[in-house]
Interface confidence: medium
């Protein structure tokens, strides 16, 4: 077994002793920036630079593949089956980011039951499930590997999931084909995605300096927290349930429950573009309210 | 080869305490985590506590505040003290250490049995 699959979310080869097994990744129980984290409402900080995050809105094709530890889906390139020739990369900007990076992959984490599966949690309240869309950052470096352990290296769009009857289109092309990837090794194509159709209908977002929220956990990872969930079914979620870490002789356990617990967030702030105030009473663009007394709090559809 | 081996197992009252050992033939001071996992009948196997090199534990959370794990690295020995036990407990104990060579490697014991009467 190779360091970088030996590895699991609970145990003792769990994410208390990540950082104790393997003196490479150190960071996991030493690191001051770590992710996940819980977002508290009322210590968002405002500010007015933060721009929308833009994501390229073209399709692209790749694999999505059960690891054994989580469902990846990953950008594929001209030397996969079934592209029609070289893609156009799909890239991140905008935000908090000083860069444009390069979108690498895609991230599930999800429970064995709805009241945990996120990374990230909203005063304390997880959701069912969290899709992590990365990137690297394409103009200081060649690819996702190198970027990883840089600085400023990597951007991770966190996307929360509500249970909801009807399910966002472009997660259901995902779990279309989870069928296909039940044991750890599987994986299938995806053709034509829509990274940008993922993201929930909104602009605004909360973002934190922090880690990649496995092994080794580097702490290059500029994260956005995107402040709209998007919605699951029931059903996708059972079939999320149904895939296994291991291979059809030797399933070993189910693949949920692949989430990461919350880390210290110490000194780091978190800013938000959230502004409660855009315009004045006649009709005229206010300012952006920096009052220390304006406090965010959570609202009530995270009890839905 | 490692080899692990549990003692301490046995029948003890609803509220009784029992302390677990696990030998190993082979030093410890390389299994930078050492732990106790349990499997109840007809139950998966669950983890109940860890312990790292440096002292750093871990515990389930049907565990916490009840269960202590400890090890004594001199003696190649870690230990998982019961208290308060419930008939929740009841369960087959089993002793895993984490060895770090050229590649990690997960050693087991053969497991003890604890049973708790209410």
């Known amino acids: 077994v190779s360091w970088e699959d030996w590895w699991t979310y609970d145990g003792i080869s769990g994410p208390a002793f990540w950082g104790l097994i393997n003196p490479e990744w150190s960071l996991c129980n030493k690191g001051r920036r770590q992710s996940p984290v819980n977002l508290e409402p009322q210590r968002l900080l405002f500010d007015p630079n933060l721009r929308p995050m833009h994501i390229d809105k073209h399709r692209i094709s790749g694999l999505i593949t059960n690891t054994g530890h989580s469902v990846i889906f990953t950008a594929g390139n001209d030397t996969v089956a079934n592209y029609d020739g070289m893609q156009t990369p799909v890239n991140i900007s905008g935000g908090p980011l000083s860069y444009r990076y390069r979108f690498h992959e895609i991230h599930m984490h999800y429970g064995l039951n709805d009241q945990f599966g996120s990374e990230h949690s909203v005063e304390g309240y997880t959701f069912p499930a969290e899709i992590q869309i990365f990137g690297y950052n394409s103009q200081l470096y060649a690819n996702f590997s190198d970027a990883l352990n840089r600085a400023q290296g990597i951007v991770g769009v966190s996307i929360l999931l509500q249970l909801g009857d009807l399910s966002n289109a472009e997660l259901r092309m995902l779990t279309d084909q989870l069928e296909r990837i039940r044991y750890g090794g599987d994986e299938a194509f995806v053709k034509r995605l829509s990274i940008r159709g993922l993201l929930p209908d909104t602009d605004h977002y909360m973002t934190y300096d922090g880690s990649t929220t496995a092994p080794a956990c580097h702490e290059t990872v500029t994260w956005v927290v995107l402040n709209k969930p998007i919605y699951i079914t029931k059903q996708q979620l059972h079939a999320l349930r149904r895939l296994m870490q291991g291979s059809p002789d030797h399933p070993k356990a189910p693949l949920g429950n692949n989430y990461r617990p919350p880390q210290p967030l110490l000194h780091r702030p978190i800013r938000t573009n959230i502004d409660f105030k855009t315009t004045k009473s006649n009709g005229k663009a206010a300012c952006p309210t920096m009052y220390r007394e304006v406090y965010y709090k959570a609202t009530s559809w995270k009890q839905n | 080869q490692v080899q692990l081996q549990e003692s301490g197992g046995g029948l003890v009252q609803a509220g009784g305490s029992l302390r677990l050992s696990c030998a190993a033939s082979?030093?410890?001071?390389?299994?930078?985590?050492m732990g106790w996992y349990r499997q109840a009948p007809g139950k998966e196997r669950e983890f109940v506590a860890g312990?790292?090199?440096?002292?750093?534990?871990n515990y389930a959370d049907s565990v916490k505040g009840r269960f202590t794990i400890s090890r004594d690295n001199a003696k190649n020995t870690v230990y998982l003290q019961m208290n308060s036990l419930k008939p929740e407990d009841t369960a087959v104990y089993y002793c895993?250490?984490?060895?770090?060579?050229?590649?990690?490697?997960?050693?087991w014991g053969q497991g003890t049995q604890v049973t708790v009467s209410s």
């Open positions: 895993a250490a984490v060895y770090v060579g050229s590649s990690p490697y997960e050693y």
């Open positions: 082979g030093t410890i001071s390389y299994a930078p985590v």
């Open positions: 312990i790292s090199l440096g002292g750093n534990t």
